[in-house]
């Protein structure tokens, strides 16, 4: 799935429009596909293709549907109970639920290593040392370079997910 949920990504708290379905909360909670009204008396349905909720909740809002970033393909559309599912395009990857954008898979393994895993939408190619069989993943550091990890750039202007 793609795109980060930020404070701006929540569907605004709003009174139910006449066409929005209402039902009563169960044990104070509303089912997936709904959020609770401000007075707590009603469950208001999320709007198909616009926002969603995945779990029983007493939230005053539904979460806004993700729009897939460029470099991603839409696997399934947003429904009232499930967010859009986006996947990195062929030749790129992002670890599942990582906040990073899709990154290009490496084209080959460093010297002395052999490829044992292909590029997938959620993982880079996997390399192991020829002799020891130990795994190597991530960028290939220059000789003597210290390897540190740093967070990736967040997805573009925070289109929303859940």
């Amino acid at each position: 799935e793609s795109a980060l949920i930020t404070q701006q990504d929540l569907a605004p708290q709003q009174r139910a429009a006449p066409q929005q379905k209402r039902s009563s909360p169960s044990e104070g909670l509303c089912p997936p596909g709904h959020h609770i009204s401000e007075d707590g008396r009603d469950c208001i349905s999320c709007k198909y293709g616009q926002d969603y909720s995945t779990h029983w909740n007493d939230l005053l809002f539904c979460l806004r549907c993700t729009r897939c970033d460029s470099g991603e393909v839409e696997l399934s559309p947003c429904t009232t109970t499930r967010n859009t599912v986006c996947q990195c395009e062929e030749g790129t990857f992002r670890e599942e639920d990582s906040p990073e954008m899709c990154r290009k898979c490496r084209t080959g393994c460093p010297r002395g290593m052999v490829k044992v895993g292909d590029c997938t939408p959620w993982s880079d190619i996997e390399c192991v040392h020829k002799e020891s069989g130990t795994k190597h993943s991530g960028e290939v550091p220059a000789v003597e370079e210290t390897v540190t990890s740093s967070p990736g750039t967040p997805a573009s202007p925070c289109s929303l997910s859940g």
Epitope: S2, L4, P99, A155
Partner: nanobody, 124 residues
Framework: EVQLVQSGGGLVQAGDSLRLSCAAS????????MAWFRQAPGKEREFVTY????????AYADSVKGRFTMSRDNAKNTVYLQMNNLKTEDTAVYYC?????????????????WGQGTQVTVSS
């Protein structure tokens, strides 16, 4: 990044109640996504509940719906998990988590700050 320190937990009987606390420090929590997860021995870390620091309400996993409640105390910068009518299957290490932005709110991978974990054991 936010630092999270948990307290509460322990050994209780089935049907009892327990409250876990998660105190945050390091920065203001305005707009932060907060969640509780749990991990039973030999199992994956699973979603329990989720909310946003400065907005009312929470979302709950089916397994805890109607028994667990998430709340916040702004003055104490603390998030609580009130657990009622505990069952033996609630036995796990419970973790609170926080992030300024999340990709999938019910996935542990979406959170960058974690509490140290609190053991909850429910005996029959």
């Amino acid at each position: 990044e936010v630092q999270l320190v948990q307290s509460g937990g322990g050994l209780v009987q089935a049907g009892d109640s327990l409250r876990l606390s998660c105190a945050a420090s390091g920065r203001a929590l305005t707009g932060y996504h907060m969640a509780w997860f749990r991990q039973a021995p030999g199992k994956e870390r699973e979603f329990v509940t989720y909310g946003i620091w400065d907005r009312a309400g929470a979302a709950y996993a089916d397994s805890v719906k109607g028994r667990f409640t998430m709340s916040r105390d702004n003055a104490k910068n603390t998030v609580y998990l009130q657990m009622n009518n505990l069952k033996t299957e609630d036995t796990a290490v419970y973790y609170c988590a926080a992030s300024m932005a999340v990709r999938t709110y019910y996935s542990p991978r979406s959170y960058d700050s974690w509490g140290q974990g609190t053991q909850v054991t429910v005996s029959s």
